[in-house]
């Protein structure tokens, strides 16, 4: 079952997700998507990182923390009721089926 997080309409929502990088110059790609984590990748991707940078994002989504040290928590700006639902944080460790998947439920009041 998903861990539940709450935010109020018009505020910013925070969805935590963390990992420990092996080395600063060798980050693990991460994707965030709207909807539960599928078998591979993220569905409806809202943000993605590569070995160094955030390389894809949509306008209201960002990583406010130090993602290069493994804080890949997602901030969603100025949420509405439509932002309610399940979000997937997927940490894409190398190797087959090594990904760590986290489903987080966002409830907007």
């Amino acid at each position: 079952s998903e861990v539940e997080y709450r935010a109020e309409v018009g505020q910013n929502a925070y969805l935590p997700c963390f990992y420990t990088p092996a080395a600063p110059g060798n980050l693990v790609p991460v994707c965030w998507g709207k909807g539960a984590c599928p078998v591979f990748e993220c569905g409806n991707v809202v943000l993605r990182t590569d070995e160094r940078d955030v390389n894809y994002w949509t306008s209201r989504y960002w990583l406010n923390g130090d993602f290069r040290k493994g804080d890949v928590s997602l901030t969603i700006e100025n949420v509405t009721l439509a932002d309610s639902g399940i979000y997937c944080c997927r940490i894409q460790f190398p190797g087959l089926m090594n990904d760590k998947k986290f489903n987080l439920k966002l409830v907007i009041k």
Epitope: G25, E51, D53, V54, R60, W62, L63, N64, G65, R68
Partner: antibody, heavy 114, light 108 residues
Framework: QIQLQQSGPELVTPGTSVKISCKAS????????INWVKQRPGQGLEWIGW????????KYNEKFKGKATLTVDTSSSIAYMHLSSLTSEDSAVYFC???????WGQGTTLTVSS | QIVLTQSPAIMSASPGEKVTLTCSAS???????LYWYQQKPGSSPKLWIY???NLASGVPARFSGSGSGTSYSLTISNMETEDAASYFC?????????FGGGTKLEIK
């Protein structure tokens, strides 16, 4: 102490190419990214791209793809930027900067003129 | 790409005056990777403030930085003549990394 020492000024003709160097010292060259930045006279700064000397991996600003090529020589701790098909728009000061943009080279002035 | 808009583009301040420079991002960026640089004519940019609010080595305590998400600022509590320079904000969380257009701060 950490230092980035760049090559000297260049005066070249349009259509030619140039290779600018950035010699790193005071740290383990292969452990940290090198960034390259362009500044035209009296204007702002533009990020060109980075290279990770440990692997040779590169990433370019889309605007500079096909214009700039980043390489390294790990044996001498030197990062290079090759600029091709030069035009007057490429006249600028080019900086190398350290992994976290905390250390910068002194800049290399490139003038493209016929 | 993320556009960083700095304002004002040029400003003058008297010694002792409080000065605030702003940097607005077109989309949210990590506060860990929002930096400010000081640049004087003929010199390389110098790291001035890193991770939004941390002063680089040797930067006087009259400087401070704050912000998060899409809105950041650099403040000088008491302007001094040596502070006359151009200041650039910079984000290097999202690729391509981008710089603001700069604020040229002059002494009155």
């Amino acid at each position: 102490q950490i230092q980035l020492q760049q090559s000297g000024p260049e005066l070249v003709t349009p259509g030619t190419s140039v290779k600018i160097s950035c010699k790193a010292s005071g740290y383990t060259f292969t452990d940290y990214y090198i960034n390259w930045v362009k500044q035209r006279p009296g204007q702002g700064l533009e990020w060109i791209g980075w290279i990770y000397p440990g692997s040779g991996n590169t990433k370019y600003n889309e605007k500079f793809k096909g214009k700039a090529t980043l390489t390294v020589d790990t044996s001498s701790s030197i990062a290079y930027m090759h600029l091709s098909s030069l035009t007057s728009e490429d006249s600028a000061v080019y900086f190398c900067a350290g992994d976290r943009f905390d250390y910068w080279g002194q800049g290399t002035t490139l003038t493209v003129s016929s | 790409q993320i556009v960083l808009t700095q304002s004002p583009a040029i400003m003058s301040a008297s010694p002792g005056e409080k000065v605030t420079l702003t940097c607005s991002a077109s989309s949210g960026v990590s506060s860990s990777y929002l930096y400010w640089y000081q640049q004087k004519p003929g010199s390389s940019p110098k790291l001035w403030i890193y991770s939004t609010s941390n002063l680089a080595s040797g930067v006087p305590a009259r400087f401070s930085g704050s912000g998060s998400g899409t809105s950041y600022s650099l403040t000088i509590s008491n302007m001094e003549t040596e502070d006359a320079a151009s200041y650039f904000c910079h984000q290097w969380s999202n690729s391509p990394y981008t710089f603001g257009g700069g604020t040229k701060l002059e002494i009155k």
